[in-house]
Interface confidence: low
């Protein structure tokens, strides 16, 4: 239904706390360089205005669209051009072009320093002094670094953060209580961020149809007892929610997500038997819980997929009459039977099925042509299964750090032109797939591995788009989203690459490395490893291992030395010489 005042409607639906949080996230995602105080001031102004509209929907400007209201606020910021350059040009446009322009200027890799967590005591003091401001800072700092973070989900993580601080700040040993819990939230939030960015990429590059296909596959796996009409309704609603969030319409997105959660909880009987626990929770926890609810038990009496999609004499007729509906039912039926497949694989199979029908239904004898289609799925299924087995075996053998190094070597050889920091970030993230997925039961490994890798590779593509340097990467990134991961896996050493000349300073280290946290030490070592591969792209695994072992030994020796500086300055050049010899 139409509301006289959109802003009053959303304020009433969401309540003040969530309204303010979402407006703060929206502003932080659009203008990523502004300080918290600047955004907090704008948020307060917008909230005060919303309250006047709640009191009187006919008050001045209350009938304006949210894009108009928010855009006007952002465009009124002083010194916009000095701080944001050409983003200020957006302000010369009218809606909806102005909002589109803001979206295009979102920066996936803003030049902000990494988010550092303060000492436990300091955090607790600040949190106790002003919990609202503390949580506001959290929302602001995460949102500006992750401009596509799923806003209602970010409110959920802020709530988690809040609960952890409330609990741990009351304990004697705050540090040991906070650290593992906050690390857990951080890890989950980072994964949530790359997954959501993938959804927005799908929406931006390939439109709603592509996202809806993803949603149908995912929902069919989770709710195999729901009928096709129910799955279609859920997929349509979920597509709308994600479209709104990806488009910066965060108030509408959060409101519609709450509606979807309400609908699911009111219709459990036709959706899934596993929803009750989620539905007993308050709003943010409920929606989060529903988004990762366990798969319902598959119906026992499902007929073979071939009956309706290969053996039926009407296949081509059904396909011709309503292509999207017919393909949708195929995707639904195949996905509900295969919770053990990744969504990417299911979409590749659906694409293969569609291509087969397109070709065969134009021939003289269609059934003879498409009769073997299910057998033709086999290599498509085997490829990711082999990928999982190979990589999980390697992870179990090497551990997370060693596995990251193996991936780093592999990807530096595939795309040596890519900047070392990007390669290291990608390899570290790709390498985490082992810890995340390889410990799961067999039937959960494939969906976990492939869908996570796809999301990480999407980030690689986004960063590469900014400064394209590798034809290999451009080739894999310009195809469809579901083909990206197999494309990257299939890449081999880039034969066109001219090796980097050996620079001693790249491999020169100082005693300050000794005091770095373990993670930072690893990054330094991995940076050196990538540079070695760029110098010798065809170095064997044994050669690289020799050099890295030598390097680790050198660091260990010098960091334990009484006079560290002397050790680094005398042993460092020897290490460089040995490295050159080992790779010669």
């Amino acid at each position: 239904e139409a509301h006289k005042s959109e802003i009053a409607h959303r304020y009433n639906d969401l309540g003040e706390q969530h309204f303010k949080g979402l407006v703060l996230i929206a502003f932080s995602q659009y203008l990523q360089k502004c300080s918290y105080d600047e955004h907090a001031k704008l948020v307060q102004e917008v909230t005060d205005f919303a309250k006047t509209c709640v009191a009187d929907e006919s008050a001045a400007n209350c009938d304006k669209s949210l894009h108009t209201l928010f855009g006007d606020k952002l465009c009124a910021i002083p010194n916009l051009r000095e701080n944001y350059g050409e983003l200020a040009d957006c302000c010369t446009k009218q809606e909806p072009e102005r909002n589109e322009c803001f979206l295009q200027h979102k920066d996936d890799n803003p030049s902000l320093p990494p988010f550092e967590r303060p000492e436990a005591e300091a955090m607790c003091t600040s949190f106790k002094e002003n919990p609202t401001t503390f949580m506001g800072h959290y929302l602001h700092e995460v949102a500006r670094r992750h401009p596509y973070f799923y806003a209602p989900e970010l409110l959920y993580y802020a709530e988690q953060y809040n609960e952890i601080l409330t609990q741990c700040c009351a304990e004697a040993d705050k540090e040991s209580c906070l650290t593992p819990k906050l690390d857990g939230v951080k890890e989950k939030a980072l994964v949530s961020s790359v997954r959501q960015r993938m959804k927005c990429s799908s929406m931006q590059k390939f439109g709603e149809r592509a996202f809806k296909a993803w949603a149908v596959a995912r929902l069919s796996q989770t709710f195999p007892n729901a009928d096709f009409a129910e799955i279609t309704k859920l997929a349509t609603d979920l597509t709308k929610v994600n479209k709104e969030c990806c488009h910066g319409d965060l108030l509408e997105c959060a409101d519609d997500r709450a509606e979807l959660a309400k609908y699911m909880c009111e219709n459990q009987a036709t959706i899934s038997s596993k929803l009750q626990t989620c539905c007993d929770k308050p709003l943010l926890k409920k929606a989060h819980c529903l988004s990762e609810v366990e798969h319902d038990t598959m119906p026992a009496d499902l007929p073979a997929i071939a009956a309706d999609f290969v053996e039926d004499q009407e296949v081509c007729k059904n396909y011709a009459e309503a292509k999207d509906v017919f393909l949708g039912t195929f995707l639904y039926e195949y996905s509900r039977r295969h919770p053990d497949y990744s969504v990417s694989l299911l979409l590749r199979l659906a694409k293969k099925y569609e291509a087969t029908l397109e070709k065969c239904c134009a021939e003289a004898n269609p059934p003879a042509c498409y009769g073997t289609v299910l057998a033709e799925f086999q290599p498509l299924v085997e490829e990711p299964k082999n990928l999982v087995k190979t990589n999980c075996d390697l992870y179990e053998k090497l551990g997370e750090y060693g596995f990251q190094n193996a991936i780093l070597v592999r990807y530096t050889q595939k795309a040596p032109q890519v900047s070392t920091p990007t390669l290291v970030e990608a390899a570290r993230n790709l390498g985490r797939v082992g810890t995340k997925c390889c410990t799961l039961p067999e039937d959960q490994r494939l969906p976990c591995v492939e869908d996570y890798l796809s999301a990480i590779l999407n980030r690689v593509c986004l960063l590469h788009e900014k400064t394209p340097v590798s034809e290999h990467v451009t080739k894999c990134c310009s195809g469809s989203l579901v083909e990206r991961r197999p494309c990257f896996s299939a890449l081999t050493v880039d034969e066109t690459y001219v090796p980097k000349e050996f620079k001693a300073e790249t491999f020169t280290f100082h005693s300050d490395i000794c005091t770095l946290p373990e993670k930072e030490k690893q990054i330094k070592k991995q940076t050196a490893l990538a540079e070695l591969v760029k110098h010798k792209p065809k170095a064997t695994a044994e050669q690289l291992k020799t050099v890295m072992d030598d390097f680790a030994q050198f660091l260990d020796t010098c960091c334990k030395a009484a006079d560290k500086d002397t050790c680094f300055s005398t042993e460092g050049p020897n290490l460089v010489t040995r490295c050159k010899d080992a790779l010669a």
Epitope: S35, L112, E116, E119, A122, T125, S126, E141
Partner: nanobody, 123 residues
Framework: EVQLLESGGGLVQPGGSLRLSCAAS????????IGWFRQAPGKEREGVSC????????NYADSVKGRFTISRDNSKNTVYLQMNSLKPEDTAVYYC????????????????WGQGTQVTVSS
């Protein structure tokens, strides 16, 4: 009221040393990264050094590396900038600024600023 107050500036000969202090009142510094900036007459304000809230991460402008050291004493709610081997080109008004949690790459990223203290290096 939130305030940052710089002190310790003055006139010093080339090669000499000064220690600047940045004291916070009205809020606890534990939660903030503190950056030191300087502005010479007719020039833009430039970053000199910064220390993250945890104290674990520090950075320095190339022009002061090896000569300046930043440190913090949270119990005193104060951050220090030890300046050694001073040169005439270090002459400027020095400001400290606070930003939540970590150092920023742009001047605008800082939420609170002090009034500044003059440092003059001259023989």
């Amino acid at each position: 009221e939130v305030q940052l107050l710089e002190s310790g500036g003055g006139l010093v000969q080339p090669g000499g040393s000064l220690r600047l202090s940045c004291a916070a009142s009205g809020f606890t510094l534990d939660y903030y990264a503190i950056g030191w900036f300087r502005q010479a007459p007719g020039k833009e304000r430039e970053g000199v050094s910064c220390i993250a809230s945890s104290g674990g991460s520090t950075n320095y402008a190339d022009s002061v590396k090896g000569r300046f050291t930043i440190s913090r004493d949270n119990s005193k709610n104060t951050v220090y900038l030890q300046m050694n081997s001073l040169k005439p080109e270090d002459t400027a008004v020095y400001y400290c600024a606070a930003a939540v949690l970590e150092c920023r790459t742009v001047v605008r990223g800082y939420d609170y600023w002090g009034q500044g203290t003059q440092v003059t290096v001259s023989s």
